[in-house]
């Protein structure tokens, strides 16, 4: 029977700069029941506080609700592991909420095949930003990435969409069912998880265009860029 091993705070994330959660990995338990507590202070202060909510984030976590979250302050935190034989402390972790934002995935991904009479058909997709993010305040700039693949393909084709919430692509395989997903990230943060896959059957009469893919910066009337397959393989990871 031994004192507990050293725990490690390995991740802190905020969905929207208004709340955040940190998670730790326990060290060895020393063969005895072990209690964990997270304590923190704000940089420039000496007053220590204990984690306000050990429940919301699941096991081995600390959740900071709105009233405990300040955007302009750095948090200094550590985890204490204690059993009957003694204690051990994690290293201190410095957390600035501005840099730990990981939004929820975008919502309402809509995918349609458009077949205008006068132009080549294309796949059009649009989506909405996650509900927790208020883009109107200017606190956030969200960047988007979409990926798609035929249902049975192992490799995804990924496209960076910038700040736009619409996108269109030529060059699809007729008669295939495609999966499409979208994710987002703030300018100083982490990519969200991918949204659930939306799927669409490409008609058998869809005209394949091998040479080019179309990427639009806005709606149908917006600026359009034609990118060759060679460029695409160079600029977009698969």
């Amino acid at each position: 029977q031994l004192p507990p091993g050293k725990p490690e705070i390995f991740k802190c994330r905020s969905p929207n700069k208004e709340t955040f959660t940190c998670w730790w990995r326990p060290g060895t338990d020393g063969g005895l029941p072990t209690n964990y507590s997270l304590t923190y202070h704000r940089e420039g202060e000496t007053l220590m506080h204990e984690c306000p909510d050990y429940i919301t984030g699941g096991p081995n976590s600390c959740h900071f609700g709105k009233q405990y979250t300040s955007m302009w302050r750095t948090y200094v935190m550590m985890v204490n592991a204690t059993n009957q034989m003694g204690s051990s402390f994690s290293d201190e972790l410095y957390v600035d909420v501005t840099y730990i934002v990981q939004p929820d995935p975008p919502l309402e991904l809509t995918v349609e095949v458009k077949q205008p009479e006068d132009r080549k058909p294309y796949l059009w997709m649009k989506w909405s930003p996650p509900t927790l993010i208020d883009l109107k305040t200017g606190w956030f700039t969200l960047l988007y990435e979409i990926r798609l693949k035929p249902e049975k393909a192992a490799e995804w084709e990924t496209h960076f969409a910038g700040q736009q919430t619409e996108f269109k692509i030529l060059s699809l395989h007729p008669g295939q069912k495609y999966l499409v997903q979208v994710r987002c990230k703030p300018d100083h943060g982490y990519w969200s998880a991918w949204s659930p896959a939306t799927f669409i059957q490409i008609p058998s009469d869809f005209i394949m265009n091998d040479e080019q893919k179309l990427i639009s910066e806005e709606d149908l009337g917006g600026e359009q860029k034609l990118i060759s397959e060679e460029d695409l393989h160079h600029h977009h990871h698969h």
Epitope: D104, P105, L107, E108, L109, T110, K149, E151, K152, A153, A154, W156, K177, L179, A193, W194, S195, P196, A197, T198, F199, I200
Partner: antibody, heavy 114, light 107 residues
Framework: QVQLVQSGAEVQKPGASVKVSCKVS????????IHWVRQAPGKGLEWMGN????????IHAQKFQGRVTMTGDTSTDTAYMELSSLRSEDTAVYYC???????WGQGTLVTVSS | EIVMTQSPATLSVSPGERATLSCRAS??????LAWYQQKPGQAPRLLLY???TRATGIPARFSGSGSGTEFTLTISSLQSEDFALYYC?????????FGGGTKVEIK
């Protein structure tokens, strides 16, 4: 012909863990993200989570936080779902489901009883 | 979490008649909605995805409509094999959720 074949029925005691397997054929696991769905006797369907073998990412319903682990072995095209700290209300048929929802395993009955 | 509400809980219909099943989402799910049929002792079977696109092998008597928060599954002329449980499910965002189901029984 895509098929998902699951492991057989299990009886477990409260507090124990169960690991259900889902063997994919007619497809490679790397191309197929897997959902796990369960159905308690006489009840509706409940989504548990999703495992994407391509990047190893998992997403799960909040109620299973800390209890469910979804993994996959791409060398055998097999996905796994492990549920720990079992209680009687976890008694259910557990299904693995392909990403587009048109491929379902046959289901695995897990009974939790002392 | 988006709550999916199906109505009615039970629908009694005569063979050959039309059945209309409703599914309501607590917030918009765009067209990211699927319908399933489940018979006793069997896994669910996908009928429709994208709110209105029939899955492979599904007869034309099954049709779906709606977007946003209100969705409908219509079975134009019920066959004996259509008497079963029907579920809707959204895949708009995590977590995915199912409706409570509608049982279509013989009148």
């Amino acid at each position: 012909q895509v098929q998902l074949v699951q492991s057989g029925a299990e009886v477990q005691k409260p507090g124990a863990s169960v690991k259900v397997s889902c063997k994919v054929s007619g497809y490679t696991l790397t191309a197929l993200s897997i959902h796990w769905v369960r159905q308690a006797p006489g009840k509706g369907l409940e989504w548990m989570g999703n495992f994407d073998p391509g990047d190893g990412e998992t997403i799960h319903a909040q109620k299973f936080q800390g209890r469910v682990t979804m993994t996959g072995d791409t060398s055998t095209d097999t996905a796994y779902m492990e549920l720990s700290s079992l209680r009687s209300e976890d008694t259910a048929v557990y299904y693995c489901v392909g990403v587009t929802f048109d491929y379902w395993g046959q289901g695995t009955l897990v009974t939790v009883s002392s | 979490e988006i709550v999916m509400t199906q109505s009615p809980a039970t629908l009694s219909v005569s063979p050959g008649e039309r059945a209309t099943l409703s599914c309501r989402a607590s917030q918009s799910v765009a067209s990211n909605l699927a319908w399933y049929q489940q018979k006793p002792g069997q896994a669910p079977r996908l009928l429709l995805y994208g709110a209105s696109t029939r899955a492979t092998g599904i007869p034309a008597r099954f049709s779906g409509s709606g977007s946003g928060t209100e969705f409908t599954l219509t079975i134009s002329s019920l066959q004996s094999e259509d008497f079963a449980l029907y579920y809707c499910q959204h895949y708009n965002n995590w977590p995915l959720t199912f409706g409570g189901g509608t049982k279509v029984e013989i009148k």
